[in-house]
């Protein structure tokens, strides 16, 4: 679990792009808006995030969707799918 810390000035992510790979885990937690992440999930697969950084992104989605991810997110999980547990997948309402 990444500790909750305020996002440093000027580091709030305006979009999901390659510059985020330079963020430390706590910066990803503090500076990436979960709703923005959810709407730009299709970009994540093309960005070389580390295994540990993907953990943070998953944590953000889990907080945004505690009852399970919507289909719009599930369709674009890409490598984040590797982070999903059977418990996570059971929450999905996929048609």
């Amino acid at each position: 679990e990444v500790e909750k810390t305020a996002c440093p000035s000027g580091k709030k992510a305006p979009e999901i792009d390659e510059s985020l790979i330079f963020y430390k885990k706590w910066e990803l937690e503090a500076c990436v808006d979960a709703a923005l992440l959810a709407t730009q999930m299709d970009r994540v697969n093309a960005i070389p995030f580390t295994y540990e950084q993907l953990d943070v992104l998953k944590h953000k989605l889990d907080e945004l969707y505690p009852q399970g991810y919507p289909e719009s997110v599930i369709q674009h999980l890409g490598y984040l799918f590797l982070k999903m547990s059977p418990e996570d997948i059971r929450k999905w309402n996929v048609t």
Epitope: A46, I47, P48, F49, Y51, Y79
Partner: nanobody, 116 residues
Framework: QVQLVESGGGLVQPGGSLRLSCAAS????????VAWYRQAPGKEREAVAV???????KYADSVKGRFTISRYNAKNIAYLQMNSLKPEDTAVYYC??????????WGQGTQVTVSS
């Protein structure tokens, strides 16, 4: 299984230069972003440079103006030109793509030591 092999590291004096190479055994570079990372003893692995599939480049603040990332898709090679090296650049350097980094699969890396 795609293999990434990093080379070009060594011992260099402060202010010196090195060029690191990353060779891939498969054609994973074309159509994918490639990044260079480094890990110093006792520290987390951190990204230092990335080049997108379109050739756009981005750098960590700590190396901006000193490091240059490039790629040669036809030969599945990526490079990291490192100039004005500092002692704090000492680390093992790795390259990777989204697929490899996502599953925590890394090459052996190449050691860079900056010391007088």
């Amino acid at each position: 299984q795609v293999q990434l092999v990093e080379s070009g590291g060594g011992l260099v004096q402060p202010g010196g230069s090195l060029r690191l190479s990353c060779a891939a055994s498969g054609s994973i570079f074309s159509g994918n972003a490639v990044a260079w990372y480094r890990q110093a003893p006792g520290k987390e692995r951190e990204a230092v440079a990335v080049i997108t599939r379109d050739g756009d480049t981005k750098y960590a603040d700590s190396v901006k103006g000193r490091f240059t990332i490039s790629r040669y898709n036809a030969k599945n090679i990526a490079y990291l030109q490192m100039n004005s090296l500092k002692p704090e650049d000492t680390a093992v350097y790795y390259c990777n793509t989204a697929r490899g980094a996502a599953v925590d699969s890394w090459g052996q890396g190449t050691q860079v030591t900056v010391s007088s």
